[in-house]
């Protein structure tokens, strides 16, 4: 009789996670009588996967009926494969005994598990930055196998080149993770811009996964300030306008100062958006010049998105306007009513748009 051989015809088998794997094994002889066992790995630490004679292996079934007369096919079927199942599987013939004695092992079949990467998650900087600054975006995807993977970055459809990518771990593993950091230079026009991280892997059949981040979360566009005086009104009132333009995000506080004293504070809300995603805001102040003996220094102070305040000042020349007799009041135009106060303190009422 020929000497028994244990034949594992496939050197390697690749299976998608969630699918089933068939590991083939045949023996060339009915002799010696004894069970087949399947192990993952070799040596003393090998893991028992299937024992023909005993044990409960809920995910493993024998492909052929083990009770079949003169059975020499000991192939197994492993269901619901996960990346943790990856490894080299050995079909090992034992001689019946107490205990059974190992006779011969097959050459082994390497099971690799194709696992899809998780949806890429893109995270931006913790704090906003202004135009011309460089910000970093990070893209992470996990749980894929095999290790080979391609990651690309795009900004508004244009591929980026300034990024660094790492796949971990460096050695063999059941599954891998990728982390990439891209550096993006911001421009004032980036409020509506988007960065895209695109991951391509053998398991995705040419349909890459994408993760996105909006630059609106990362950018701050500081406002331009312009303070102007509108035409003089008949009742000695000057209309001073503070135009705050091209800012993002909307979080903005505007304070009017008259000769250094706070006159009014306003918060921006529900502003219409410009085409480029920025916002404009106009605030105006009516100053009754007849109430002032000297020139009035008006300051428009803007605090944008928690940044240090930006000021723009404007002097209203009182000497240029004839003073109304008997009036010591600077009044706000609230429509039709002007109110007189008999005390010496100036009371200022203001209206804004």
């Amino acid at each position: 009789e020929e000497e028994l051989q244990v034949i594992q015809p496939e050197k390697s088998v690749s299976v998608a996670a969630g699918d089933s794997a068939t590991l083939n094994c045949t023996v060339t002889s009915l002799i010696p009588v004894g069970p087949i066992q399947w192990f993952r790995g070799a040596g003393p630490g090998r893991e028992l996967i299937y024992h023909q004679k005993e044990g409960h292996f809920p995910r493993v079934t024998s492909v052929s009926e083990s009770t079949k007369r003169n059975n020499m096919d000991f192939s197994i079927h492993i269901s619901n494969i996960t990346p943790a199942d990856a490894g080299t599987y050995y079909c090992v013939k034992f001689r019946k005994g107490s205990p059974d004695v190992e006779v011969k092992s097959g050459a082994g079949t390497e099971l690799s598990v194709r696992a899809k990467p998780s949806a890429p998650v893109v995270s931006g900087p913790a704090v906003r930055a202004t135009a011309e600054h460089t910000v970093s975006f990070t893209c992470e995807s996990h749980g894929f196998s095999p290790r080979d993977i391609t990651l690309k970055w795009f900004k508004n459809g244009n591929e980026l080149s300034d990024f660094q990518t790492n796949v971990d771990p460096a050695g063999k593993s059941v599954s891998y993770s990728i982390r990439s950091t891209a550096r993006v230079v911001l421009t004032r026009r980036d409020v509506h811009s988007q960065v895209i991280c695109e991951v391509a892997h053998v398991t995705l059949q040419g349909d890459p996964l994408r993760g996105t981040a909006n630059l609106s979360e990362a950018i701050r566009v500081p406002p331009f300030l312009e303070v102007t005086q509108q035409s003089m009104r008949a009742d000695n009132q000057v209309n001073v306008t503070c135009q705050v333009t091209k800012f993002y995000p909307q979080r903005l506080q505007l304070t009017w100062l008259e000769n250094g004293n706070v006159s009014r504070t306003e918060m921006a809300s529900a502003l219409p958006e410009n085409k480029d995603g920025t916002y404009n805001w106009t605030s105006w102040l009516l100053v009754n010049v007849s109430a002032h003996r000297d020139d009035v220094k008006l300051t428009c102070q803007v605090e944008h998105d928690g940044q240090p305040a930006v000021n723009k000042s404007f002097s209203v020349k009182v000497s240029a306007h004839p003073k109304e007799q008997g009036s010591n009041t600077a009044a706000e135009n609230t429509g039709t009513n002007e109110r007189d106060y008999k005390d010496d303190d100036d009371k200022h009422h203001h209206h804004h748009h």
Epitope: L30, Q52, K53
Partner: antibody, heavy 119, light 110 residues
Framework: QVQLVQSGAEVKKPGASVKVSCKAS????????INWVRQAPGQGLEWIAM????????HYNQIFKDRATLTTDTSTSTAYMELRSLRSDDTAVYYC????????????WGRGTLVTVSS | DIVLTQSPDSLAVSLGERATINCRAS??????????IFWYQQKPGQPPKLLIY???NLDSGVPDRFSGSGSGTDFTLTISSLQAEDVAVYYC????????FGQGTKLEIK
């Protein structure tokens, strides 16, 4: 290790039936055939039948085909052999035996159940 | 059905001597290069014990003084040096198709 534990001795009247049990342990019950063999006092071995517990496939010796029925209960890893219409010449020790190599041989045996048929 | 005939029916051999038991099949029990003959030993009050499978292969734990040979229709069980504990009845069995046993050979010490 493999063990086959059989039910106790039975005394039956002619024409009655007997059901002998064989509880298996130490191996996966559904992976190996169970054979039934009998031995009349002072006589040789006589093969009765065999059953595959995984799917209840059976093969019978023609002599016993009409009187013997083999069954299994996989939940308790127990095989049964029922013999009907007993006659005095059915008096024998009835053995169950496990076929380890799927060669239709008998590798491990129970200790036997004596069935006495007497009026 | 294949009929197995053992010879002799009984045999007395001196301790340390060779004992030979024959088994003849009514037709060939060979298939696919294997000879489907098995040998069992049965001591009084005990179930049979498998000694040899597929004509010539010693079962686990069986002393190597036992050996089997033969092919086709003629097979032999040999005990090279008889020991006192070898006193028993020996049966051959085939499984070329459904199993049958030989009638048995009683081995005693001379």
């Amino acid at each position: 290790q493999v063990q086959l534990v059989q039910s106790g001795a039975e005394v039956k009247k002619p024409g009655a039936s007997v059901k002998v049990s064989c509880k298996a342990s130490g191996y996966t019950f559904t992976n190996y055939w169970i054979n039934w063999v009998r031995q009349a006092p002072g006589q040789g071995l006589e093969w009765i039948a065999m059953i595959d517990p995984s799917d209840s496939e059976t093969h019978y010796n023609q002599i016993f085909k009409d009187r013997a029925t083999l069954t299994t209960d996989t939940s308790t890893s127990t095989a049964y052999m029922e013999l009907r219409s007993l006659r005095s010449d059915d008096t024998a020790v009835y053995y169950c035996a496990m076929d380890y190599g799927s060669l239709y041989a008998m590798d491990y045996w129970g200790r036997g159940t004596l069935v006495t048929v007497s009026s | 059905d294949i009929v197995l005939t053992q010879s002799p029916d009984s045999l007395a051999v001196s301790l340390g001597e060779r004992a030979t038991i024959n088994c003849r099949a009514s037709k060939s029990v060979s298939s696919s290069g294997y000879n489907y003959i098995f040998w069992y030993q049965q001591k009084p009050g005990q179930p049979p014990k498998l000694l040899i499978y597929l004509a010539s292969n010693l079962d686990s734990g069986v002393p190597d003084r036992f050996s089997g040979s033969g092919s086709g229709t003629d097979f032999t069980l040999t005990i090279s040096s008889l020991q006192a504990e070898d006193v028993a009845v020996y049966y051959c069995q085939h499984s070329r198709d459904l199993p049958t046993f030989g009638q048995g050979t009683k081995l005693e010490i001379k």
